[in-house]
């Protein structure tokens, strides 16, 4: 058994007569043989669920669900209740109604086995019938909404009459009807004014009924019509088996360059017309099992269940449904030497499904794992300026397809042929598995005999120790010019173009910092700033060379505070800034301020 509503509303007046009927509560059956029996909770409750008093005033007919006044609620009773309402004015009280034999503790009141009945209290006697507006004669102030479970026996779930009005104003004639399209499963009995379902409802056909209740009031010669919405929601049960959209039960996948743990290899979709179990329960009750096969496959793959609510069209209206994505995911990084083909089967079980038929599906994944070979071009040729500063990025090396790699740990090393000319270093970028070449020793750059640098680049897969090699030829160009004494270590300190371009800083390939002129459009990614190389800094990403020293590019790498208009980077640096941003790396501080229009020096000279 279950209530067709979780809350009911009615009005209470001082000194209303004992025996006054108040309202009906309705229960619907889950099974044809069920017979409802109602009981009231022992207490009246007030504001913020305050327990006010034992309920000595309102009774219920156990078999019909009729609530009525057992004794009049007089001023002194009301005062007694008000005193206990934690100092709040007592405008509303409520009672709990339980469906027997549901044995719920008085403290808990949750649908479907319990409903609350709210009474709005008026510190006056019942108004004269002639003063009541048609709206007050027809419907409660709070509009009801109804919940009906699908596939359950039909039954009565509402009674239109306002019982106190009917009881105290017998000369006013009130008639009701439901406005509904053809063939809807509801009827309103003209004599009893009870609304019932004609047949069991199917949520998968229609989930919401937006009906309209029409009330016609006859009082003497006048006739008035009042209309209110009458919404009914159909509650779901697990009566649909999972299916394959378009019959697709097999997915094929190739694992090659993306070999990282947590990589999604393939996805199969399952459709279920139901929206139960609810999201909290779903993963526990809607299970997926990778069927035992080869041990390697069991260790290497897992299945992830990603349910999502969707809506589908049924009989001209949209109803909710669930799509379940089953993703075949790598459970570990795969070695580049791994080479196999296999078929995996996944059993999906909608464990709440009661039939007819089975709530079980079998998903098939055909997976090919291909080996990866490491290849480098035979030769790299690069040039570097003699003026380049330490950590200046001068180029990249990359095994074939390295940008597409994930989960493949390639380390690059440089072997120099001339021991005293070992100028460059290389670090592996985690983002694209490339090797970034940078200046590591500026003293070697300045030696006249180091005009040409010869290196062997060796790329090694860390897991298998497989290698690829290439020649690297670096030409050292230009003449050395000593850097300005007293320039800051970091280009980022400078906040004007002039001071920026007269100094070098860590990471500068030319030996001079570069000014990046912003677009001046508020807080922008393209803020003005001084950088060792605008190709790499700032670019919104603290790369593996920049992490070597905070002075290279604090605009991308700073973890400290940023003062002024800005948007912080994720996870660090300045994503966007206002005007010009300059930084003091050793203090973990950056400033983003409006562009200086005038140099203070001008100010002095023009005075």
């Amino acid at each position: 058994l279950y209530f067709s509503r979780d809350a009911y509303w009615e009005k209470l007046y001082v000194d209303q007569a004992a025996g006054t009927p108040l309202l009906y509560v309705h229960a619907l059956r889950d099974a044809p043989e069920e017979v409802p029996s109602f009981r009231l909770g022992q207490h009246l409750y007030g504001t913020y669920r305050t327990r006010l008093h034992e309920n000595n005033w309102i009774c219920i007919q156990e078999d019909t669900g009729l609530l009525y006044l057992n004794r009049s609620l007089d001023h002194s009773s009301w005062e007694k209740l008000s005193v206990r309402n934690r100092g709040f004015p007592l405008l509303t009280v409520y009672l709990k109604v339980f469906l027997s034999p549901t044995s719920l503790r008085e403290g808990e009141c949750q649908w479907p086995g319990c409903a609350r009945v709210y009474f709005s209290f008026f510190n006056t006697s019942f108004p004269a019938c002639s003063s009541l507006k048609p709206r007050e004669l027809c419907f409660p102030e709070t509009r009801p909404s109804f919940r009906i479970r699908e596939n359950r026996p039909p039954g009565t779930f509402h009674q239109f009459r306002l019982l106190p009005v009917q009881f105290l104003c017998p000369n006013i004639s009130v008639a009701y009807r439901l406005l509904e399209g053809e063939g809807l499963p509801f009827r309103c009995a003209p004599d009893s004014l009870e609304v019932s379902t004609r047949w069991a409802l199917d949520r998968e056909q229609r989930e919401k009924y937006e009906l309209v209740a029409v009330c016609t009031v006859h009082a003497g010669a006048r006739e008035e019509v009042v209309m209110v919405p009458f919404p009914v929601t159909v509650y779901d049960e697990d009566d649909s088996a999972p299916t394959f959209p378009a019959g697709v039960d097999t997915a094929s996948a190739v694992v090659e360059f993306k070999r990282k743990e947590d990589t999604v290899v393939a996805t199969l979709r399952v459709f279920d017309a139901d929206v139960v179990p609810a999201s909290g329960e779903l993963v526990r009750r809607y299970t997926s099992t990778l069927l035992p096969g080869d041990t390697w496959a069991q260790q290497t793959f897992r299945v992830e269940h990603w349910p999502n609510e969707t809506s589908v069209q049924a009989n001209g209206s949209f109803v909710r449904a669930t799509v379940h994505d089953y993703r075949l995911v790598l459970n570990r990084n795969l070695s580049i030497s791994e080479n196999r083909t296999m078929q995996l089967a996944v059993l999906v079980n909608d464990s709440d499904f009661q039939g007819p038929g089975a709530g079980v599906l079998l998903l098939h994944f055909n997976v090919s794992v291909l080996p990866v070979s490491l290849h480098l071009p035979s030769t790299y040729s690069l040039s570097v300026s003699r003026r380049a500063r330490r950590f200046a990025q001068i180029g990249k090396v990359c095994v074939e397809n390295c940008q597409a790699f994930s989960g493949i740990n390639v380390q690059y090393k440089l072997h120099s042929s001339g021991a005293n000319c070992s100028t460059l270093g290389v670090v592996t970028s985690a983002e694209d598995t490339s090797g970034i070449l940078f200046v590591n020793d500026t003293k070697a750059l300045r030696r006249p005999k180091c005009a040409e640098l010869h290196y062997m680049v060796v790329a090694t897969d860390q897991q298998t120790s497989r290698q690829a090699q290439a020649q690297l030829l670096v030409t050292v160009e230009g003449s050395y010019v000593a850097e300005e004494a007293g320039c800051p270590l970091s280009c980022a300190v400078s906040k004007r173009r002039l001071e920026c371009e007269e100094c070098g800083g860590l990471g500068s390939p030319t030996g001079r910092c570069e000014w990046r002129q912003g677009d001046g459009k508020g807080i922008t990614r393209n803020f003005s700033t001084c950088s060792p190389s605008t190709k790499t800094c700032p670019d919104g990403h603290c790369d593996v060379v920049e992490t070597q020293d905070i002075n290279i590019c604090p605009q991308d790498c700073l973890r400290g505070s940023i003062v002024g208009g800005h948007e912080p980077g994720e996870p660090r640096g300045i994503k966007a800034g206002y005007g010009t941003c300059n930084c003091f790396p050793e203090e973990e501080k950056c400033f983003c301020e409006p562009e200086d229009i005038q140099d203070p020096l001008c100010d002095e000279l023009c005075r």
């Epitope: 800051p488 906040k495 973890r559 400290g560 003091f584 973990e588 501080k589 203070p600």
Partner: antibody
Framework: EVQLVESGGGLVQPGGSLRLSCSVS????????MRWVRQAPGKGLEWVSG????????YYADSVRGRVTISRDNSKNTLDLQMTNLRAEDTAVYYC??????????????WGQGTLVTVSS | DIQMTQSPSSLSASVGDRVTITCRAS??????LNWYLQRPGKAPKLLVY???SLQSGVPSRFSGRGSGTDFTLTISSLQPEDFATYYC?????????FGQGTKLEIK
């Protein structure tokens, strides 16, 4: 009210060690970089060492590099300067200072009263 | 390293006088310059930062000017408590050097 109080100064022999401390109150310590500045008797001010708010970045004047270590404990609001292998020319009043920043660099807006370190045999 | 040179090294003046102290950097430090006052036996006190910004609580008779390599601190009308030693300091490049000081004495 912002307060910086240095302690730990005294007489030490050449080659000896000393640990200076600076206890601070009146501001959110972890949000500010700190400095040690010294002043030899009758002489000018000399910047000695600095540390960022988090303590993650430290830096030193060439005259003390390798002999001095700056550190901070943000939970206790203290700044320390560990000095080893002391020389006669390290004799000075040592001040701890709070560093504030504008986009034109650091300035020292609050200073302690100083603690005297004398290196002599 | 950047050298900071103050002039004059010492200066005699009277209460009410207008006094200017100069600080020169060995290379351009733009406006990355601060001024401090130090009374005998006391800790230094910040007067001006970023070449011309007056620290809060510092009387308006103090003012700073300059950019690049040449900077001045001006006291428009000397008060008795202003007789002390004044230091400039650059904050452009480590080590953050101070000038040698200018001692302002009562005439």
């Amino acid at each position: 009210e912002v307060q910086l109080v240095e302690s730990g100064g005294g007489l030490v022999q050449p080659g000896g060690s000393l640990r200076l401390s600076c206890s601070v109150s009146g501001f959110i310590f972890k949000n500010y970089a700190m400095r040690w500045v010294r002043q030899a008797p009758g002489k000018g001010l000399e910047w000695v060492s600095g540390i960022s708010g988090s303590g993650g970045i430290t830096y030193y004047a060439d005259s003390v590099r390798g002999r001095v270590t700056i550190s901070r404990d943000n939970s206790k609001n203290t700044l320390d300067l560990q000095m080893t292998n002391l020389r006669a020319e390290d004799t000075a009043v040592y001040y701890c200072a709070k560093a504030e920043y504008s986009s034109s660099g650091a300035y020292f807006d609050y200073w302690g009263q100083g603690t005297l370190v004398t290196v002599s045999s | 390293d950047i050298q900071m040179t103050q002039s004059p090294s010492s200066l005699s003046a009277s209460v009410g006088d207008r006094v200017t102290i100069t600080c020169r950097a060995s290379q351009s430090i733009h406006n990355y310059l601060n001024w401090y006052l130090q009374r005998p036996g006391k800790a230094p006190k910040l007067l001006v930062y970023a070449a011309s910004s007056l620290q809060s609580g510092v009387p308006s008779r103090f003012s700073g000017r300059g950019s690049g390599t040449d900077f001045t601190l001006t006291i428009s009308s000397l008060q008795p408590e202003d007789f002390a030693t004044y230091y400039c300091q650059q904050s452009y490049s480590a080590p953050y050097s101070f000038g040698q000081g200018t001692k302002l004495e009562i005439k």
